[in-house]
Interface confidence: low
């Protein structure tokens, strides 16, 4: 038989025995001559090296390139392939020789007392026990122990081949400690050497690289990559790395087994690749492959090597961010850099710290943005190695949909006396300012619920036919004033006013404001009454703990059953697009109050007294009167505001001053508080008494000292007191110059 590929114009070596297989008896001589066209060598079984003493290779006497192999008294162990080949080529001729030795049918390895077979417990894998035969057609079975089991060739997955050995599925003998082959010749049993069975695993569960991704270094830094393979037990792992610069001087590879917990069904292997000082050529893909022989798993990661540490903003970094109140705002710091920079956010120059409303990290997150968040935000990136800094300013503009102030200030229902001139106001706050404020109206009787009608939760009015105020036919004569702009509570607001020249008809008015991010509206119930009138005694706006009484006066000949109510918390608050329910048609929202009735010659007066007003008493008070003839109810509503008690404070300071004799001193002391405090002046801790030269004006707020004299020098104190305490300020007045002598002297 011939093996190898023919090289140019070179014939295969020719053997003297032109057969693939030669069978000879033991104790005979084996002689084969090989002829060729260049230097030849022989290889034979067991000892392939040519140092066997019994084997003789001689040059032929009759040819240049010719060698004869001779083995006298052959034994069974000489069975095998004999190969004649050209030196340093693959060209060879092979003959397989069986040396039939019936006393030793299995070829024994020269050195081995026993062999080792490695198997995996894989259903699909077979193992070969290398019990080769010196006779080709033996009846061979495999014995495994313990417990003892015998396996016979089945013509399928179990077989014996004299040149190869005994083939069997590995799982069948994985239980065994040892196996051997057995041949029967003329009722005589012959055994091969023993083979110890070693079960090896092969499964690799995973291969993990650490760090797994985003590896960035700068030139000169150390790269350490750990590759961990997790396998089943009895596995040996061979690691193989692929990386960009394979000719690396400073590369170091360390492989080791990792300890796992006892009883673990898993083994861990670690391979660590270290490059002490990376260069730009080390940038690229690093792949670690772990192989168990039957299985290979790999994992890769990209290593980026920068020339030097750096930091820069990414192209997607925003400069203007627009948001609407209440939204969540996210401003990411988009950067390029190595190593990752330290990120610090500033608002209008002040460092931002994270809290429950704001998170200042890689992304600046404002949970619920409000107007006060408007401003310039500066993000500063600092490279932790080079300390290089980059800054970028992001302007945040927070838009506010129109908010109508009166919604929260004025009652949703109010009554107006017949024939009076009234002004309705919408004060709108919006960013950007509203691009329009429009007024609409509709008649109250067209849109109010009759008591018999079921009130729909989503729409408390059966109609929504709003008409433009330009079309006031059938309603009150209206004039819309030009919008004005006012600074209220430090905010720029747009004020739209609608003047009703004569209150003749009950109607509903709506102002609607629109800007780029939304709309707001306010519905005003303009209920016109010829009925009762409400007055407050003694003050329009009482302070806490003061007494106040609400007087409801009605013509006795027209009205009866006067009753005071307080408007309770409404079950249907007013939303965008909804209208207030007229009070008289919805008594469910009213709380009846105790009151005292008085009469005079023409009117009934129902007085409801609040002896000790508190902030809880604030709200809408309703006086209801019934028409004696028609029994129709008439309502008047009055909003009561109770002012909170505030201790006295003095705004501004008295300042020490130096004045020349004969000049004047003018100082003022402005005090605030509720109830309003009384102001008193003291000189050197004694009450200051008015005389021709000392004048107190405006409730003692202003003090004037005319034609000052030396004796006017001293410590002046302004003191403001109320039931809640006192506040005071002091100043020292110095009088310079000599006192003029009077004529009397």
């Amino acid at each position: 038989a011939s093996v190898g590929l023919p090289s140019v114009s070179l014939d295969l070596p020719r053997l003297s025995i032109q057969k693939d297989i030669l069978t000879i008896k033991a104790n005979t001589t084996l002689q084969i001559t090989c002829r060729g066209q260049r230097d030849l060598d022989w290889l034979w079984p067991n000892n392939q090296s040519g140092s066997e003493q019994r084997v003789e290779v001689t040059e032929c006497s009759d040819g240049l390139f010719c060698k004869t192999l001779t083995i006298p008294k052959v034994i069974g162990n000489d069975t095998g392939a004999y190969k004649c080949f050209y030196r340093e080529t693959d060209l060879a001729s092979v003959i397989y020789v069986y040396v039939q030795d019936y006393r030793s049918p299995f070829i024994a390895s020269v050195s081995d007392q026993h062999g080792v077979v490695y198997i995996t417990e894989n259903k699909n894998k077979t193992v070969v026990i290398p019990c080769l035969g010196s006779i080709s057609n033996l009846n061979v079975s495999l014995c495994a122990r313990y417990p003892e089991k015998r396996f016979v060739p089945d013509g399928n997955r179990i077989s014996w081949d004299s040149k190869k050995g005994f083939t069997i599925p590995s799982y069948m003998i994985s239980y065994a400690g040892m196996v051997f082959c057995e041949a029967k010749i003329n009722d005589e049993s012959y055994q091969s050497i023993m083979y110890i069975v070693v079960v090896v695993g092969y499964r690799i569960y995973d291969v993990v690289l650490s760090p797994s991704h985003g590896i960035e270094l700068s030139v000169g830094e150390k790269l350490v990559l750990n590759c961990t393979a997790r396998t089943e037990l009895n596995v040996g792992i061979d690691f193989n790395w692929e990386y960009p610069s394979s000719k690396h001087q400073h590369k170091k590879l360390v492989n080791r087994d990792l300890k796992t917990q006892s009883g673990s069904e898993m083994k861990k292997f670690l391979s660590t690749l270290t490059i002490d000082g990376v260069t730009r050529s080390d940038q690229g893909l690093y792949t670690c492959a772990a192989s168990s022989g039957l299985m290979t798993k790999k994992n890769s990661t990209f290593v980026r090597v920068h020339e030097k540490p750096f930091v820069a903003f990414g192209s997607g970094m925003e400069s203007l961010v627009e948001a609407t109140v209440g939204e969540r705002v996210r401003i990411p710091a988009k950067y390029l850099g190595y190593p990752p920079p330290e990120i610090k956010w500033y608002k209008n120059g002040i460092p931002l710290e994270s809290n429950h409303t704001i998170k200042a990290g890689h992304v600046l997150t404002i949970m619920e943005v409000s107007e006060r968040d408007t401003g310039n935000y500066t993000v500063i990136l600092t490279n932790p190695i080079s300390k290089e800094k980059q800054s970028h300013v992001v302007s945040l503009v927070v838009y506010v949909p129109p908010q109508i102030g009166e919604k929260s200030l004025i009652s949703p229902v109010d009554s107006y006396q017949y024939g009076t001139t009234q002004t309705l106001t919408c004060t709108v706050y919006a960013i950007p300012p509203p691009h329009h404020i429009h007024w609409y109206w509709q008649l109250e009787e067209e849109c109010a619920n009759e008591p018999s009608q079921a009130v729909s939760v989503t729409n408390p009015y059966p109609c929504e036919e709003w008409r433009s105020v330009e079309d006031f036919q059938g309603g009150n004569k209206i004039e819309v004033n030009k919008n004005q702009f006012a600074l209220i509570e430090g905010k720029n607001k747009t004020v739209s006013t609608l003047v009703i020249q004569a209150a003749n008809v009950s109607a509903l008015y709506k102002c609607e404001a629109v800007n780029k991010v939304g709309r707001g509206e306010r519905v005003i119930s303009f209920h016109v009454t010829r009925g009762p009138e409400i007055t407050l005694q003694p003050d329009m706006q009482p302070t806490e703990q003061e007494s106040v009484s609400l007087w409801c006066t009605a013509d006795r000949s027209t009205f009866e059953n006067l009753t005071w109510y307080k408007l309770g918390p409404q079950p249907l608050p007013i939303h965008v697009g909804e209208l207030p329910t007229p009070v008289c048609k919805n008594l469910d929202t009213l709380w009846k109050l105790n009151a005292t009735m008085f009469s005079n010659s023409t009117n009934d007066i129902l007085i409801m007294e609040l002896k000790n007003a508190s902030l809880q008493d604030q709200g809408d008070y309703v006086c209801l009167a019934q028409d004696r003839k028609t029994k129709k109810r008439h309502c008047v509503v009055r909003q009561l505001t109770v002012l909170e008690r505030v201790a006295p404070t003095i705004t501004g300071n008295l300042e020490n001053q130096t004045t020349s004799i004969g000049e004047s001193i003018e100082v003022s002391c402005t005090a605030s508080g509720n109830p309003p405090p009384q102001i008193m002046w003291f000189k050197d801790n004694e009450t200051l008494v008015e005389d021709s030269g000392i004048v107190l004006k405006d409730g003692n707020r202003n003090l004037t000292i005319r034609r000052v004299r030396k004796e006017d020098e001293g410590l002046y104190t302004c003191q403001a007191c109320s039931v809640l305490g006192c506040a005071k300020v002091e100043a020292f007045f110095i009088i310079e110059g000599a006192q003029e002598k009077t004529n009397l002297e």
Epitope: G326, V457, T458, P569, P571, L572, P573, H575
Partner: nanobody, 124 residues
Framework: QVQLQESGGGSVQAGGSLRLSCVAS????????MGWFRQAPGKEREGVAG????????YYANSVKGRFTISQDNAKNTVYLQMNTLKPEDTAIYYC?????????????????WGQGTQVTVSS
């Protein structure tokens, strides 16, 4: 400080009914939107029903539509969840949730305050 206290949970046979209550203290249910969430064993918390401020609109998850009803009593500052035709898959801890006036709390991200939860067990 805001507190939401649920009650009304318990065990019931499939097909039965329960009414859960949630009393709010330190928080007005009429001025804010409210909702109910539930968390079944091994599952994430999910929105079941919501009601906007003022109670003018109600919202339900598909799984409970037609069987559960959310309502509120402003005077009692209480939100209710009426659960009819209960199924074993309704078994969960039910949580009361409070949001801002808008939107109603149907997802966790808009919830401002949570109750402690009440167990509902429906057996077949």
């Amino acid at each position: 400080q805001v507190q939401l206290q649920e009650s009304g949970g318990g065990s019931v046979q499939a097909g039965g009914s329960l009414r859960l209550s949630c009393v709010a203290s330190g928080y007005s249910v009429s001025k804010n939107s409210m909702g109910w969430f539930r968390q079944a064993p091994g599952k994430e918390r999910e929105g079941v029903a919501g009601i906007n401020y003022g109670g003018t609109a109600t919202y339900y998850a598909n799984s409970v539509k037609g069987r559960f009803t959310i309502s509120q009593d402003n005077a009692k500052n209480t939100v209710y969840l009426q659960m009819n035709t209960l199924k074993p898959e309704d078994t969960a801890i039910y949580y009361c949730a409070a949001g801002s006036p808008d939107p109603p709390p149907l997802i966790e991200g808009v919830v401002k305050y949570w109750g402690q939860g009440t167990q509902v067990t429906v057996s077949s």
